[in-house]
């Protein structure tokens, strides 16, 4: 007989998730309405396509990227979809409450859905560090806390540091990475005897993870350009992101081979490193004046990513209990920092070039912005980690980590747990 959810979780999850969904429906009923204005239909279609690209990145890209575990691939993909669906709903409301609410109702536009999808993406990046060690009820908590923390961070940053939509959203890489790592740090770490094989990657799930990486690779330019407000900015962002990810692919594959004693290529390195350039140019993608700079950034990002994948997993596994194949967290944390540093360098060059004073003050503001993003990520991540450790959620036993059978019905399996 196939395994069942523990009784308590069977009671807890549907009740918790459906009550939450009912609450969201009520909030939408009382506080939202659609944008009633007449749209230019061509513009509407173009705007929808950007949102569609982001949804593909989230549902297929990040969904499959995290599916490389031997016995946890179903859960990775489906839990990602569940978190995305829930995260988008809450993010739309939260963004509306934080930015529009004083005027009455929250107006829902394609742009607000775009923003919400990007906010929900944050959770999908973070969750890579904890997938396999938590159940759906715990993931609901993680979605709510992280989306709320990111929404508030974006509002605080836009108000205090006066940054536009693009800039305050591009902290998502650093925020999501540090949030995920701090949640992982709070969860039970040691993998008990007999479960080591479960966090290993298998060929078919690894292939689906590569498929996820390919989708992300294709659509990363859309993500980096989605919130820019002019065609020339979007064009620069698309071009620079494309050049950066193209170079990071070449670097990832050749660097992975270089890092192996027999010159073999590691699937895990490649899954993650192909995206390195996109993360590194994210913040400054619209400011980089020529392709060669974006390409150099892609090269450096690819090398950092491969280097990180080679040397950091041991440390992360010991300290945070993150399996070797879940390298998105520390990868994004390093590459996000690289991207922020590049932005500050470009800002200094631009300020010097314009002959304006206050360079030191500008740099201080940028560093303050980055520091605030990291601090809020760590604090909210620790809070989430502590919440997830509460007995109420009936977390999977360590022996059931990285196991689809705990959550899914497999009629063809005779042996249960």
């Amino acid at each position: 007989m196939s395994s069942k959810y523990p009784r308590s979780v069977r009671r807890c999850l549907p009740l918790w998730a459906l009550t939450l969904e009912a609450a969201l429906i009520l909030l939408f009923y009382f506080f939202t309405h659609y944008d009633a204005s007449l749209e230019d239909q061509k513009g509407l279609v173009a705007s929808y396509q950007v949102g569609q690209d982001l949804t593909v990145m989230a549902a297929i890209g990040l969904g499959f990227l995290t599916s490389s575990f031997r016995r946890h691939s179903w859960s990775s993909v489906a839990f990602n979809l569940f978190m995305l669906a829930l995260g988008v709903q809450w993010a739309i409301l939260l963004d509306g409450f934080l930015s529009q609410f004083p005027s009455g109702k929250v107006v829902i536009t394609l742009f607000s859905i775009r923003l919400a999808t990007m906010s929900a993406l944050s959770v999908l990046i973070s969750v890579d560090a904890v997938l396999g060690k938590v159940n759906l009820a715990q993931l609901v908590v993680m979605v709510l806390v992280e989306v709320t923390a990111l929404g508030n961070l974006r509002m605080v940053i836009s108000n205090i540091f006066n940054t536009d939509y693009h800039m305050n959203m591009m902290h998502i890489y650093v925020f999501a990475a540090y949030f995920g790592l701090s949640v992982a740090w709070c969860l039970p770490k040691p993998l008990p005897e007999g479960t080591e094989d479960k966090d290993q990657t298998a060929t078919i799930p690894s292939l689906s993870a590569m498929l996820g990486a390919l989708f992300l690779w294709m659509f990363w330019p859309s993500f980096n350009s989605a919130l820019l407000r002019s065609p020339i900015e979007r064009k620069n962002a698309v071009f620079n992101t494309y050049y950066a990810v193209a170079v990071s692919v070449v670097t990832a594959i050749s660097g992975s081979s270089l890092a192996h004693p027999q010159g073999k290529i590691s699937k895990t390195y490649v899954h993650s490193a192909v995206l390195a350039g996109g993360v590194a140019v994210g913040t400054s993608c619209h400011l980089i004046p020529s392709p060669w700079l974006a390409m150099v950034l892609g090269l450096v990002a690819g090398l950092i990513s491969v280097g990180g994948a080679k040397y950091l997993p041991g440390c992360c596994n010991r300290v945070l209990g993150i399996p070797h194949s879940s390298i998105m967290g520390y990868n994004f944390s390093l590459l996000g920092l690289l991207g922020e540093i590049i932005y500050i360098v470009l800002l200094v060059l631009d300020t010097v070039g314009a002959g304006n004073g206050m360079i030191g003050f500008q740099v201080l503001l940028s560093i303050g912005e980055l520091s605030l993003a990291i601090v809020i990520a760590l604090m909210s991540g620790l809070l989430t980690g502590l919440l997830l450790n509460l007995k109420i959620w009936k977390a999977p036993h360590e022996a059931k980590y990285f196991d689809d059978q705990v959550f899914w019905k497999f009629p063809h399996l005779a042996v249960g747990f």
């Epitope: 204005s37 749209e39 230019d40 513009g43 509407l44 173009a46 705007s47 950007v50 930015s99 536009t109 394609l110 742009f111 775009r114 974006r154 509002m155 836009s158 108000n159 540091f161 006066n162 940054t163 536009d164 939509y165 305050n168 407000r229 002019s230 065609p231 020339i232 900015e233 620069n236 619209h286 400011l287 800002l347 631009d350 300020t351 314009a354 002959g355 304006n356 206050m358 003050f361 500008q362 503001l365």
Partner: antibody, heavy 121, light 111 residues
Framework: QVQLVESGGGVVQPGRSLRLSCAAS????????MHWVRQAPGKGLEWVAV????????DYADSVKGRFTISRDNSKKTLYLQMNSLRAEDTAVYYC??????????????WGQGTLVTVSS | QTVVTQEPSLTVSPGGTVTLTCASS?????????PNWFQQKPGQAPRALIY???KKHSWTPARFSGSLLGGKAALTLSGVQPEDEAEYYC???????????FGGGTKLTVL
């Protein structure tokens, strides 16, 4: 050369609606964000609303939020401002302006000559 | 509610130099507020002069220059001409949405 021509102004009673238009020529309209700015008689300029180049996002000043709607038709090279629930304090000359947004550059570049809206009973 | 403050009026002699400033109630003005300056003469539409702190439009005379001074945006006119007598407005962009807020305007008189 760049030309912006506002129309649709006039005298209207409080609580009624009015729709302003801004016809653009001499540049690629669909590549530019557009703004409405107003100026009450004898007073300073007040920013009203912005719409992005593709119409995907719009934002408003608090004083008009929920009452005014900015929209555009790129195929007609026209910008609109739908004004509902008009008040006496909405009396002003309304200007449309193009937005330059590139990297770390932001500007209201070209302005129309304006159209006068008078809200009076 | 954000307030942008300018000097209500300034007087300058022809050929002289004058600096108009623009302060924000939120604190120091930086290049991230993209300060813009406009000139408006009676009965005319505003005309853009300076954008993004110090950049000039193709039609902006060389005697106009923009900068940041002590946490404020500044517009400096060197070698003032009689035709520079006008109202000058600054515009700052705020927050994620980059909403515009104009200053109250400075009436420049050339005596």
């Amino acid at each position: 050369q760049v030309q912006l021509v506002e129309s649709g102004g006039g005298v209207v009673q409080p609580g009624r609606s009015l729709r302003l238009s801004c016809a653009a020529s001499g540049f690629t309209f669909s590549n530019y964000g557009m703004h409405w700015v107003r100026q009450a008689p004898g007073k300073g300029l007040e920013w009203v609303a912005v719409i992005w180049f593709d119409g995907s996002n719009r934002d408003y000043a608090d004083s008009v939020k929920g009452r005014f709607t900015i929209s555009r038709d790129n195929s007609k090279k026209t910008l609109y401002l739908q004004m509902n629930s008009l008040r006496a304090e909405d009396t002003a000359v309304y200007y449309c302006a193009t937005e330059l947004a590139r990297g770390r550059l932001r500007a209201l570049e070209y302005w129309g000559q304006g159209t006068l809206v008078t809200v009076s009973s | 509610q954000t307030v942008v403050t300018q000097e209500p009026s300034l007087t300058v002699s022809p050929g002289g130099t004058v600096t108009l400033t623009c302060a924000s109630s939120t604190g120091a003005v930086t290049t991230g507020y993209y300060p813009n300056w406009f000139q408006q003469k009676p009965g005319q539409a505003p005309r853009a002069l300076i954008y993004s702190t110090s950049k000039k439009h193709s039609w902006t005379p060389a005697r106009f220059s923009g900068s940041l001074l002590g946490g404020k945006a500044a517009l400096t006119l060197s070698g003032v001409q009689p035709e520079d007598e006008a109202e000058y407005y600054c515009l700052l962009f705020y927050g994620g949405a980059q909403l515009g807020v104009f200053g109250g305007g400075t009436k420049l008189t050339v005596l």
